[in-house]
Interface confidence: low
Amino acid sequence: DTHKSEVAHRFKDLGEEHFKGLVLVAFSQYLQQCPFEEHVKLVNEVTEFAKTCVADESAENCDKSLHTLFGDKLCTVATLRETYGEMADCCAKQEPERNECFLQHKDDNPNLPPLVRPEVDVMCTAFHDNEATFLKKYLYEVARRHPYFYAPELLFFAARYKAAFAECCQAADKAACLLPKLDELRDEGKASSAKQRLKCASLQKFGDRAFKAWAVARLSQKFPKAEFAEVSKLVTDLTKVHTECCHGDLLECADDRADLAKYMCENQDSISSKLKECCDKPLLEKSHCLAEVENDEMPADLPSLAADYVESKDVCKNYAEAKDVFLGMFLYEYARRHPDYSVMLLLRLAKAYEATLEKCCAAADPHECYAKVFDEFQPLVEEPQNLVKQNCELFEQLGEYKFQNALLVRYTKKVPQVSTPTLVEVSRNLGKVGAKCCKLPEAKRMPCAEDYLSVVLNRLCVLHEKTPVSEKVTKCCTESLVNRRPCFSALELDEAYVPKAFNAETFTFHADMCTLSEKEKQVKKQTALVELVKHKPKATKEQLKGVMDNFAAFVEKCCKADDKEACFAEEGPKFVAASQAALA
């Protein structure tokens, strides 16, 4: 399927609107500090060039690869050295090394100001004045803050963003209509970004075998009526799509994703009965719908797994003949029978099964050796079941904020070297598992909770890789993708940690605390809590609770005072002294 001009091929396949959007996303994800106008200029130049290639595929430079074309364009940015430092050295390299270099410089935590939401009337005016620019600005701002955001999915978010403004800017109460929609898009967007970051980490750090195993398990849960060969085909195609997007090949990724959606809709009968309503939708919506589709019903008459994978005398023969196919089939068969298990648990079970076969197929009596393999799965299954049960009980008892605080303390004690902002961000997100998963029926709790925790812990791993400070974090993040969560769960208080010296500055608060939103107030308090634990890692729950209760009372008192700043100046040092005494 070779084309004389790759850029013309993609422009024709995707259409101008999607082509321009994806190029803007690609450039914004690579050059995250560049101003919006600079990116728009580059995109327009690339688009005009693509059009000349559509008109004549033999025109000059039209035969160049997309990496060459895009890389050459990025390297024309005048301020590359001043803005990006050593990233400018990428431009001295040839493809494919130049693109690899750009990828390595993507920053998961760019030093960009938080997005401030203007007044609704201001946003509506901007939307009506220049809708195209308004939507491009959205793509740019999200892409530069989330350099691994799944690009075709970001186009879908932009379409929803546009629809929200088109509807609400005509409404009687614009704010009541628009703000909940924007909140929903923000929260869904952050979740989508984090999920995609795990897919890219899986591919980049553990290889496509790890990603394919994840995909076999997940798709087998979703499509339990599909044949293994059908699931295998979907896995191969999905792996290609995500490899491309994670590698910055956004045009190819979006094109292949559209092809995959087309294939799934043309072959619904052999995939799932749940695809019908997705397949009537327009492209972006259809692809999103297919990705989020609920699990199909399990076939009623599935036989016991034991016959083929334990009792059969041919287990070692089948395993030796084609290891990955046999293990893939085992994973498929197990996953389609267990929508109640997390994908990570299913992968641990497949890993345990593989280890048993490696050992037993070399033994004198292989069948005798692997006969009890399913019994060995029990502790692996019970561990996440118990973890979910205990943490949901704690969540129900404490509520979200205090549950987050419990996790903040737990994780700060485990890995106190990690920066306070990272511990606060990660623990707050870990704490959101309660509201997200604990309300679900028993059969959906574990897949919801553990697979969500894997996404959140990947964020910790990604941030820690940028600035490594803890050998324990490095070990949990790099040794095994499927065992990351159990690895972190198993960490105890770090006895080797030297407590942080007390710094009164850290616990000095001002009247601006009173004007913060509830969420911002929580973050301030939680930041203080982390610092307290870093100062006194062996403080008991009761001691920490006492200090935090005093802190809340002190803030509440001063925010009610006439002269707030004077109150903070007077009461602050008393609070610090009382806290030090309580923790002594």
Epitope: A226, E227, F228, A229, E230, S232, K233, Y263, N267, D269, S270, D308, N318, E321, A322, V325, F326, M329
Partner: nanobody, 115 residues
Framework: QVQLVESGGGLVQPGGSLRLSCAAS????????MSWVRQAPGKGPEWVSA????????RYSDSVKGRFAISRDNAKKTLYLQMNSLKPEDTAAYYC????????GSQGTQVTVSS
């Protein structure tokens, strides 16, 4: 690497017979259901027939029911399609696939029914 190689196609007169074979390698053949699919010039792929892993359950599209018979030999890792009472509309490239997929995983073998 999974490989499927079809053979047995050719030119045959209407009412004639052919037997297609599909030799499989690179996977545990005896654990998979298999299908025959065909694609006529200028048309999309059409599922023809399927057989389960053990060979006990066979299925056919309405257009070939009663004329074609699917079978397998797991020891030889080979899938067969016996085609009788062939008609001009059976003219197509025939290829075998794992499971019920209609996605082409092989070159196929050409069957032409013409007088």
């Amino acid at each position: 690497q999974v490989q499927l190689v079809e053979s047995g196609g050719g030119l045959v007169q209407p009412g004639g017979s052919l037997r297609l074979s599909c030799a499989a390698s690179g996977f545990t053949f005896g654990s998979f259901g298999m299908s025959w699919v065909r694609q006529a010039p200028g048309k999309g792929p059409e599922w023809v027939s399927a057989i389960d892993s053990g060979g006990g359950d066979t299925r056919y599209s309405d257009s070939v029911k009663g004329r074609f018979a699917i079978s397998r030999d797991n020891a030889k890792k080979t899938l067969y399609l016996q085609m009788n009472s062939l008609k001009p509309e059976d003219t197509a490239a025939y290829y075998c696939t794992i499971g019920r997929s209609t996605s082409r995983g092989s070159q196929g073998t050409q069957v032409t029914v013409s007088s």
